[in-house]
């Protein structure tokens, strides 16, 4: 079953390469188990950036080596992606799946264009 | 008389606060005197950033204290805005006027969204 997912159109990564955005899913009821996946689309290629399954009311737990962290509140997921470089500029799509209880619901956002600018290197200290 | 003006939708300022974009106007004939104005729109307020009048084939000359520089080639104007800070993020609109010979033509672009990220300060050297 299809589900509406909203996310901002544009986000700027900080000069430290950190970008945060909210992914909000409009469910007709309260799910107990939700899976959130961040996909990156660039040059018509789609790759998975990170994913987490969480029980509503609990924290999102990404893998230890993941570049993503997140928190949830109601149907809103606050996602943070770190370690971004200019070459990571692209469209980051939020995919939400209501895993339990059945039936399964799937929602895919329109994507957030994340712009990343590499910082100028600091001058060497003499 | 109306005239079509094209400019990119989005540009990222460098970490040094420099943003460049091309403003191209579709003139029905060959003008000899052209005026280019850059306007900034933010929070429904429009302010003039800089302006230059030039003779086709010659360099654009902005005022000495202007944050803009530029070059022209045919109907294309290469504009560079410097000294940008995060607070300067906004929609930068290119306005082109064909001043001479008559008739007078006016064209206004859809604007270029310039995103600016302030760099992290470098650590103090001991």
């Amino acid at each position: 079953k299809a589900m509406h997912v909203a996310q901002p159109a544009v986000v700027l990564a900080s000069s430290r390469g950190i970008a945060s955005f909210v992914c909000e899913y409009a469910s007709p009821g309260k799910a107990t188990e939700v899976r959130v996946t961040v996909l990156r689309q660039a040059d018509s290629q789609v790759t998975e950036v990170c994913a987490a399954t969480y029980m509503t009311g609990n924290e999102l737990t990404f893998l230890d080596d993941s570049i993503c962290t997140g928190t949830s509140s109601g149907n809103q997921v606050n996602l943070t992606i770190q370690g971004l470089r200019a070459m990571d500029t692209g469209l980051y799509i939020c995919k939400v799946e209501l895993m339990y209880p059945p039936p399964y619901y799937l929602g895919i956002g329109n994507g957030t264009q994340i712009y990343v600018i590499d910082p100028e290197p600091c001058p060497d200290s003499d | 008389k109306a005239m079509h003006v094209a400019q990119p939708a989005v540009v990222l300022a460098s970490s040094r606060g420099i943003a460049s974009f091309v403003c191209e106007y579709a003139s029905p004939g060959k003008a000899t005197e052209v005026r280019v104005t850059v306007l900034r729109q933010a929070d429904s307020q429009v302010t003039e950033v800089c302006a230059a009048t030039y003779m086709t084939g010659n360099e654009l000359t902005f005022l000495d204290d202007s944050i803009c520089t530029g070059t022209s080639s045919g109907n294309q104007v290469n504009l560079t805005i410097q000294g940008l800070r995060a607070m300067d993020t906004g929609l930068y609109i290119c306005k082109v006027e064909l001043m001479y010979p008559p008739p007078y033509y006016l064209g206004i672009g859809n604007g270029t969204q310039i995103y600016v990220i302030d760099p992290e300060p470098c650590p103090d050297s001991d």
Epitope: H4, A26, S27, P28, G29, K30, A31, T32, S73, G74, N75, L98, P101, P102, P103, Y105 | -
Partner: antibody, heavy 119, light 106 residues
Framework: DVQLQESGPGLVTPSQSLSLTCSVT?????????WNWIRQFPGNKLEWMGY???????NYNPFLKNRISITRDTSENQFFLKLNSVTTEDTATYYC????????????WGQGTSVTVSS | DIVLTQSPSSLSASLGGKVTITCKTS??????MAWYQHKPGKGPRLLIY???ILQPGIPSRFSGSGSGTDYSFSINNLEPEDIATYYC????????FGGGTMLEIK
Amino acid sequence: DVQLQESGPGLVTPSQSLSLTCSVTGYSITSGYSWNWIRQFPGNKLEWMGYIRFDGNNNYNPFLKNRISITRDTSENQFFLKLNSVTTEDTATYYCARNYGTWGAMDFWGQGTSVTVSS
Amino acid sequence: DIVLTQSPSSLSASLGGKVTITCKTSQDINKYMAWYQHKPGKGPRLLIYYTSILQPGIPSRFSGSGSGTDYSFSINNLEPEDIATYYCQQYDNLNTFGGGTMLEIK
């Protein structure tokens, strides 16, 4: 399309039990969703009574917890309401409806059945 | 229990006009708000869920908005078939309904 249909006696005497059936077509009640009973009192107020989930677990309105039971017959694709020790205050139109999740919006409803509690 | 205060309890409007109904909740419900249309002899019909999402097949004349404890529901370009009673429902904790708004056409 999913359809729900309530049935049961229109008149119940005080202190007796009220029993209603909701027959579901177009979707298996064991496949998903929660299957609810809601009632509307003569003044138009709607009250959620409780549900039985796809897995057979229940959730009831705390105000009714001691008197209510919702069960099901999976072979007939039906679920049932039993309300004990009824009084005239239980006179209402009773609806069955479906919702997603623990709590949720009811996307399909029956047309309702009127129950009067009177001696 | 979360209490929903729906207002007005009744209203009269002209064909082609616009009406707005409000629903105030006794605590923040995280946008878990639904709106129903109810006509005599039928079951309620789900119009909107999660504050503003139109149920498939519902005309865009119907809309919802809100957050926290304050929610509203509007019908634009009123049509004769809109005569009904409208209810709000929260589904953040248990399922509870507002008192209803009876809409009539002038």
